[in-house]
Structures are given as structure tokens and as C-alpha cells.
């Protein structure tokens, strides 16, 4: 099976690696621009230099290219609790992350929010907090896990999934109520 190629990939595949086909003359292969630069003018002829210019502040290219414009640097989303790990340079986009003792929850492939790692109060740490995953807690007896926090079995209602974990406590409460009736 031949993989489907877009027009640009088809044009590029005619030239050796690191070169691209001249948009106005398909007999000319021009050298691609280095990362950190962009295409200002195509090479005028075979063996002649491509006119590449350095990206301006606030923009970048992370790989060799023949882009007419550099890409805009990403901004870390403060409203999502993100912090800047490393700032944008001409050849690398901004790197955003979370603070210490926080993890990322991805809303989509390119949007994440920072949340505090669970401390496992009234329980023990089963798996430590990771970059993209909250701490996994195991609760002490008399507590059940709800939204990754250990909650007292006194807060367990019969309709919730905690009933199996809290069954002895629920039976005790029920027994106390029953014995109080005349």
C-alpha cells in the first residue's frame, strides 16, 4: 500500500533530504532553512542559496523548514494553573508545566490544567503523584475513596458504591437505630 501524500509532501519527495522543490520551477531543489529561521526567498537557481531569515522575537521554528512565517510562541495558560518551564527561543516553543506537587489533567491533547496532588489523608500512598496522574490512595479502615480522597464511612449512603467497603459501619449504624426503637 502506498501511503497518501499531500501535495507539499509529494513535491518535497522529488528532492533529496534537506531540500524542497522550488514552487515556480519543479526542476530546482532548494535547501531548506535551518530551525530558528524561515524562508524569505526561494533559491534563484540550482546550487544557489535559499534566503533564510532568523525568526523575530515571539516566534520560532523547531525544525528545518520552508515556512514563509515563523510560528507564534505558545503562552502558558495562567487560568489553568500553568507555569513557564522554559521560555520560547527562535528554535524552540515555550514549555509549560505545573508547579511542584501538582499534576496535569488533559482536557484535550493540547490543553491541560494543573491540579494539586492528593495527600492521602486518612489513607496511604499506593502510587506516587506523576506528571500526568494524581496520587493513587488506599484508605484506612472506616474510610472509603471518593474523588481520590479518603472520606469517613459515616458519609456513606446506601445508594453509593462505598456500601461494600463500609458495610460493617453501615450495619452498626443500622443496628443502633433498630435497637433504639420500641
Amino acid at each position: 500500500l502506498v501511503p497518501h501524500l499531500g501535495d507539499r509532501e509529494k513535491r518535497d519527495s522529488v528532492c533529496p533530504q534537506g531540500k524542497y522543490i522550488h514552487p515556480q520551477n519543479n526542476s530546482i531543489c532548494c535547501t531548506k532553512c535551518h530551525k530558528g529561521t524561515y524562508l524569505y526567498n526561494d533559491c534563484p537557481g540550482p546550487g544557489q542559496d535559499t534566503d533564510c531569515r532568523e525568526c523575530e522575537s515571539g516566534s520560532f521554528t523547531a525544525s528545518e523548514n520552508h515556512l514563509r512565517h515563523c510560528l507564534s510562541c505558545s503562552k502558558c495558560r495562567k487560568e489553568m494553573g500553568q507555569v513557564e518551564i522554559s521560555s520560547c527561543t527562535v528554535d524552540r516553543d515555550t514549555v509549560c508545566g505545573c508547579r511542584k506537587n501538582q499534576y496535569r489533567h488533559y482536557w484535550s491533547e493540547n490543553l491541560f490544567q494543573c491540579f494539586n496532588c492528593s495527600l492521602c489523608l486518612n489513607g496511604t500512598v499506593h502510587l506516587s503523584c506523576q506528571e500526568k496522574q494524581n496520587t493513587v490512595c488506599t484508605c484506612h479502615a472506616g474510610f472509603f475513596l471518593r474523588e481520590n480522597e479518603c472520606v469517613s464511612c459515616s458519609n456513606c449512603k446506601k445508594s453509593l458504591e462505598c456500601t461494600k467497603l463500609c458495610l460493617p459501619q453501615i450495619e452498626n449504624v443500622k443496628g443502633t437505630e433498630d435497637s433504639g426503637t420500641t
Partner: nanobody, 121 residues
């Protein structure tokens, strides 16, 4: 076919409350993060609130924090937005949206038709 059907909008006085609902069908509801997005008259789209698949993670825009509560009932395939202490600036068309799971230019791949919330005395 994916469908998102909002309801619960209407006219309410400042300080009042409304509860919006979004009935989802045509996809496995529990597999997706969901969102409420609004568009005020003559303005752009604004993220209001997000909720994760299981409901453990939520996001609120600063403008609605402490007043709005997002929730979901996965057994009913329904998303909710409880809106309290409503203000005139909350007047907008409110859309229910499903997050896209692949990296695209858009965060959301499906939207409801919207429900109008008008806050006025």
C-alpha cells in the same frame, strides 16, 4: 450521530438562579470531557466550565467561579450547569460542547444548538 441538546435557558432577574441541562446521545458519554461555552451578544466565545469523564476534575472561568457549578450524570448521559447569583453580564447563548480527543485546531468537535440565558430586571 452525535447530538447535544441543551435546555433550561430563559429570562431571570439579577441574583436569580437557573439550571441548564444537556442531553447527550450518539457517543459513549463516559469517555469524554465535556464543557459549557457561552457567547454574549456581539462578543466572542468564552469558556465557562469543563468537567472530566468521571466528574473529578473541573474548570471554571474566573468570571463564574463560586457562582456556577458544573456536574454530570453519567447514568443519564446528561451534563448540567447550575447558575446562581446571576448577573446582567451572564446574558449569553450557552452551548454544551464535547471535547475532541485528537489534536485539532478546535478543542471541541461537537456543539449543541445553544440555549439563551437573559439576565434582566
Amino acid at each position: 450521530e452525535v447530538q447535544l441538546l441543551e435546555s433550561g435557558g430563559g429570562l431571570v432577574q439579577p441574583g436569580g438562579s437557573l439550571r441548564l441541562s444537556c442531553a447527550a446521545s450518539g457517543f459513549t458519554f463516559t469517555d469524554y470531557n465535556m464543557a459549557w461555552v457561552r457567547q454574549a451578544p456581539g462578543k466572542g466565545l468564552e469558556w465557562v466550565s469543563f468537567i472530566s469523564q468521571e466528574g473529578h476534575h473541573t474548570y471554571y472561568a474566573d468570571s463564574v467561579k463560586g457562582r456556577f457549578t458544573i456536574s454530570r450524570d453519567n447514568s443519564k448521559n446528561t451534563l448540567y450547569l447550575q447558575m446562581n447569583s446571576l448577573r446582567a453580564e451572564d446574558t449569553a447563548v450557552y452551548y454544551c460542547a464535547k471535547f475532541s480527543t485528537i489534536a485539532t485546531l478546535s478543542l471541541f468537535d461537537y456543539w449543541g444548538q445553544g440555549t439563551l440565558v437573559t439576565v434582566s430586571s
